[in-house]
Interface confidence: low
């Protein structure tokens, strides 16, 4: 019993004054708390408390279920307890079957004996079967048996206490340990989509897959840069015993522009936080941007095929293409497909093929594409490189030499004088006039040139040349003279 | 003995705010998670959501997440249901009970009830 | 969620009588099921917790089983206080669903 000092409050005094009281069945527990401040008694078994406020506690006739801790509580908060022990041989534990374990944590069975003076007290498993090699544990009479640094492998383990009486092993009802498991990683966190671009007006849904070991993981979504509470719906499930998942999704039923942002599914548990992120785009309408992917001026040569290729980014997707050349439609040559086979795809290629152009085929090839909120459009000028073609090569009534060429790029015409019959004509000859003649007609078309000389600056024999070339190739035509006397008889061209 | 003892009806005009109690004694009252469970007129039974009073940890089912609050006062073994705003839809018997010693509150079952607390909300 | 569907919803039985109560999960629940007992203006009471463990105080006759999605409540001898409502719950996953209920009435 604890001593008193004058002047200082001291704990209560309990008779009998003995720390453990061991009672038979059936017999009176008679309790006596001595203290000028009395204030309570409290009773705790298991999770049961009773309080009794007389200084006096009387069980008439005691239970086994009477056994436990007595407390005696003053004014000043000081305490004194008895433990007393209800020896029932038809029942030798108190029992609370709940059993819930945090792995690497330990853990108590809550059988707590209502006789001290039996032996071997301890652990067994159900139905003869071995407890776990590893499992330690330390019995307490008062409290139940301790198992030492619960591990995982023992959820759902099935166990009795046991003690020896008279000679014979006597069991307690079972239990079932149920682990809850220590966190060892970081949650692992997943989203629906990396990215969302929509409509104002449109709903936002986005949806964040958390995976743990227990349901204690804590996970929220976020806006960065903002501290307002998203609206989020749960779903959870239990996968077997350490797979737990939860499904928590995010919905913005009319997104609008300024809802533009990165929003954060974040989870943690006890060991860290892990966390993913998905950007969402609104815009006020669709739109459709148009990339072209070579030089919107082709040069191409007669005969040679060319590919006009477009990229371009349509939201909402696109709903109309065409390829337009000439106010005419193609209906084959051409191909469009989505960039990408992703979901959130927007960027889409259009592939205009363009097979053995003519020098007639050049001009302006128009791509259209639409969508249900906006049109777009890009053109290609095509220019188709042609060897020059002299169309024409006479002799004028009034004594000029003519040659008209058409070709594209603008062919050059020059002109030479060959004495005698050769054709390797060398030294040239100026002309008197160049026109180009078709200027003003369509601009991708062969562009004609004309150039003339006079022929009454040659003397003697021999062939004039017209020769016309551009960077495609060149073409020449001929002319021959002879001469009867001072007479110029004849003008013969030929190419 | 173990008992959970509830707040007494309450009549409430639509739009009013109301905090129903639920206080427990002969057990040690942070150790049990506290659910409450609705039963509309001539209906069944509907989780409302759970609390832990040890440490106010606090699950609700998604019907019920946001429409109220569930909160706990530890110390004087207390547990509350409220509302910012009613509805003439909340008119119902609402109860309160101790769930069984659970792993994260899964387990065990409802062992003890409340009387229950009959809410009308009516204009 | 997991949905728990009850049947029957309702049953008319004599004093007596065997009557069976079944109770099937939307998803598997292991054996984290109880059965409860509520009689009219009464708030329910506990009969059987674990699928198949029967709660103190509640007689002998009031017996529960199975596992996984499907379960059984079975009265083995039907008495005057037992007609009732009964209601099924699932403590596996949050939210903590309960069973439609199923009435038993005196034929």
């Known amino acids: 019993q604890p001593s008193v000092s004058p002047g200082e409050p001291s704990p209560p005094s309990i008779h009998p004054g003995k720390s453990d009281l061991i009672v038979r069945v059936g017999d009176e527990i008679r309790l006596l708390c001595t203290d000028p401040g009395f204030v309570k008694w409290t009773f705790e078994i298991l999770d049961e408390t009773n309080e009794n406020k007389q200084n006096e506690w009387i069980t008439e006739k005691a239970e086994a279920t009477n056994t436990g801790k007595y407390t005696c509580t003053n004014k000043h908060g000081l305490s004194n307890s008895i433990y007393v022990f209800v020896r029932d041989p038809a029942k030798l534990f108190l029992v609370d079957r709940s059993l819930y374990g945090k792995e690497d944590n330990d853990t108590l069975v809550r059988c707590p004996l209502t006789d001290p003076e039996v032996t071997n007290y301890s652990l067994k498993g159900c139905q003869g079967k071995p407890l776990p090699k590893d499992l330690r544990f330390i019995p307490d009479p008062k409290a139940g048996i301790m198992i030492k640094s619960v591990k995982r492998a023992y959820h759902r383990l099935c166990l009795h206490c046991s003690v020896d009486q008279e000679g014979k092993s006597v069991l307690s009802e079972k239990f079932i340990l149920k682990v809850r498991p220590a966190f060892k990683a970081v949650p692992v966190v997943s989203v629906s989509k990396a990215s969302y671009l929509l409509r104002e007006g449109e709903e936002f849904t986005v949806t964040c897959t958390i995976k743990d070991v227990s349901s204690s993981v804590y996970s929220t979504w976020k806006r960065e840069n903002s501290q307002t509470k998203l609206q989020e719906k749960y779903n959870s499930w239990h996968h077997g015993d350490f797979n737990y998942e939860r499904q928590a999704t995010l919905t913005i039923s009319s997104a609008r522009v300024n809802d533009s942002g990165v929003f954060m599914c974040y989870a943690n548990n006890t060991f860290g936080s892990a966390n993913v992120t998905t950007t969402l785009e609104v815009v006020d309408k669709g739109f459709i941007n148009i990339f072209p992917m070579i030089n919107t001026t082709v040069f191409v040569n007669d005969g040679e095929n060319v590919d006009l290729i477009v990229e371009y980014e349509a939201f909402p997707k696109p709903e109309h293409q065409q390829w337009i050349y000439m106010n005419r439609t193609f209906t084959d040559k051409w191909e469009d497909y989505p960039k990408s086979e992703n979901e959130s795809n927007i960027r889409y290629v259009s592939e205009l093929h363009l097979t053995r152009l003519k020098g007639t085929e050049g001009g302006t090839y128009t791509f259209l594409v639409s969508n249900s909120d906006v049109n777009a459009a890009i053109a290609f000028n095509v220019y188709v490189n042609t060897k020059p073609e002299i169309l024409t090569y006479d002799r004028l009534v009034n004594g000029m030499l003519q040659c008209v060429a058409a070709g594209f790029p603008e062919p050059t015409i020059d002109w030479y004088f060959c004495p005698g019959t050769e054709q390797r004509c060398s030294a040239s000859v100026l002309p008197v006039d160049v026109q180009t003649l078709n200027s003003s007609g369509p601009p991708f078309g062969k562009l004609v040139v004309q150039s003339s000389i006079d022929s009454s600056a040659f003397k003697h024999n021999g062939t004039v040349e017209c020769k016309a070339y551009n960077d495609v190739g060149k073409t020449s035509a001929y002319f021959n003279f002879a001469f009867k006397g001072n007479n110029k008889e004849q003008i013969h061209p030929h190419t | 003995q173990v008992q959970l003892v509830q707040s007494g009806a309450a009549v409430k005009k639509p739009g009013e705010s109301l905090k129903i109690s639920c206080k427990g004694s002969?057990?040690?009252?942070?150790?049990?998670?506290i659910g409450w469970v609705r039963q509309m007129p001539g209906k069944g039974l509907e989780w409302m959501g759970i609390?832990?009073?040890?440490?106010?940890?606090?699950r609700y089912s998604p019907s019920f997440q946001g429409q109220v609050t569930i909160s706990a006062g530890k110390s004087i073994s207390t547990a509350y249901l409220q509302w910012s705003s009613l509805k003439a839809s909340d008119t119902a018997m609402y109860y309160c009970?101790?769930?069984?010693?659970?792993?994260?509150?899964?387990?065990?079952?409802?062992?003890?009830w409340g009387q229950g607390t009959m809410v009308t909300v009516s204009s | 969620a997991i949905q728990l569907t009850q049947s029957p919803s309702s049953l008319s039985a004599s004093v007596g009588d065997r009557v069976t109560i079944t109770c099937r999960a939307s998803q598997g629940i292991s054996s984290a099921l109880a059965w409860y007992q509520q009689k009219p203006g009464k708030a329910p009471k506990l009969l059987i917790y674990?699928?198949?463990s029967l709660e103190s105080g509640v007689p002998s006759r009031f017996s529960g089983s199975g596992s996984g999605t499907d379960f059984t409540l079975t009265i083995s001898s039907l008495q005057p206080e037992d007609f009732a409502t009964y209601y099924c719950?699932?403590?596996?996953?949050?939210?903590?669903?309960f069973g439609g209920g199923t009435k038993v009435e005196i034929k």
């Open positions: 609390i832990y009073p040890g440490d106010s940890d606090t």
């Open positions: 674990d699928a198949s």
């Open positions: 009970a101790r769930h069984g010693r659970g792993y994260n509150g899964y387990e065990g079952a409802f062992d003890i």
């Open positions: 719950q699932q403590v596996n996953s949050y939210p903590l669903t």
């Open positions: 002969g057990y040690r009252f942070t150790s049990y998670w």
